[in-house]
Interface confidence: medium
């Protein structure tokens, strides 16, 4: 399955929207910085696109979940958030279309399940952090910057796999 060109463009738009969503400077939130332990190795050890697609799907689904909560709606600009949802939704559709075409429909390798679990745990850490920080503006800014970084890393892996085909 070959993801459409628009998927690549959608990834860049998602990053642009995340950048536009910034409300305060990260420099004013230095005391709130946190290492969420993004499982980068889980994106680096998937050698076939068939293995990366479910992991990338999980990543985008979790971002969608994170930013579609009531607390998130209160934190961000509604227009930007709507555009953000649209881009994420389109990317989920692209990835799901690949799964339907037969990529990853065979029995899921344990390694892939472990990778999906690692992504879920990463987002659990982010959610817990937000709760502990009482969804403060600085906490959301730290999370926004973190999602930009991790999303960029994960989509870059996906692009590199495509370029090797």
């Amino acid at each position: 399955c070959d993801l459409p060109q628009t998927h690549s463009l959608g990834s860049r738009r998602t990053l642009m929207l995340l950048a536009q969503m910034r409300r305060i400077s990260l420099f004013s939130c230095l005391k709130d910085r946190h290492d969420f332990g993004f499982p980068q190795e889980e994106f680096g050890n998937q050698f076939q696109k068939a293995e990366t697609i479910p992991v990338l799907h999980e990543m985008i689904q979790q971002i969608f979940n994170l930013f579609s909560t009531k607390d998130s709606s209160a934190a961000w600009d509604e227009t930007l958030l709507d555009k953000f949802y649209t881009e994420l939704y389109q990317q989920l559709n692209d990835l799901e279309a690949c799964v339907i075409q037969g990529v990853g429909v065979t029995e899921t390798p344990l390694m892939k399940e472990d990778s999906i679990l690692a992504v879920r745990k990463y987002f659990q850490r982010i959610t817990l952090y937000l709760k502990e920080k009482k969804y403060s503006p600085c906490a959301w800014e730290v999370v926004r910057a973190e999602i930009m970084r991790s999303f960029s890393l994960s989509t870059n892996l996906q692009e590199s796999l495509r370029s090797k085909e």
Partner: antibody
């Protein structure tokens, strides 16, 4: 500061190929897609395609598919655009332009390379 | 392919006057991905406006952009001698990315 320096002017015969280079400096080369845009004499701008220098992934405009090849050399922070089966209507100034997000999109351009196709 | 049509093709005005340049898209363009560039003879294009209405770095406040959907406008409130050039609208809302054919702003 960000700089994109392109190779010099070329004169080619119809049917030949041309390879234009664009050397980037002043930023992390692998962090931004690089685009190629051309402009025929007295005409408007035309997007040809783009390359991700991080891993070489390319996306070409349908019009140039099969005739254009974009490559990169990360060791020298240089991208290349090769156009084959040249015809007279390919006579143009070819620009490289750096992609980015928001205000960074096409904020930096090479100086342009004139390619003349003539028999 | 989204076709961008600019009007007028040529605009003749005097310094100090107000310039209004139009860009009409063949199909809807997300305003976040509509940009304007200025080009002078022998030079590469220069970014003026990004995301329909945002001024690029170093661009004077006399330049402004507006619009949505299929109709976009670049306005120069009071023309300076250095503003006479060709102006292009550009979209990266969908592939292939396209430019308008340009509007030449000339001194009357």
């Amino acid at each position: 500061q960000v700089q994109l320096v392109q190779s010099g002017a070329e004169v080619k015969k119809p049917g030949a190929s041309v390879k234009v280079s664009c050397k980037a400096s002043g930023y992390t080369f692998t962090n931004y897609w690089m685009h190629w845009v051309r402009q025929a004499p007295g005409q408007g701008l035309e997007w040809m395609g783009e390359i991700n220098p991080s891993h070489g992934r390319t996306i070409y405009a349908q019009k140039f598919q099969g005739r254009v090849t974009m490559t990169r050399d990360t060791s020298t922070s240089t991208v290349y655009m090769e156009l084959s089966s040249l015809r007279s209507e390919d006579t143009a100034v070819y620009y490289c332009a750096r992609g980015g997000l928001g205000p960074a999109w096409f904020a930096y351009w090479g100086q342009g390379t004139l390619v003349t196709v003539s028999s | 392919e989204i076709v961008l049509t600019q009007s007028p093709a040529t605009l003749s005005l005097s310094p100090g006057e107000r310039a209004t340049l139009s860009c009409s898209a063949g199909s809807s363009v997300d305003s976040s991905y509509l940009y304007w560039y200025q080009q002078k003879p022998g030079q590469a294009p220069r970014l003026l406006i990004y995301s329909t209405s945002n001024l690029a770095s170093g661009i004077p406040a006399r330049f402004s952009g507006s619009g949505s959907g299929t109709d976009f406008t670049l306005t120069i409130s009071s023309l300076e001698p250095e503003d006479f050039a060709v102006y292009y609208c550009h979209q990266w809302s969908s592939y292939p990315f396209t430019f308008g054919q340009g509007t030449k702003l000339e001194i009357k």
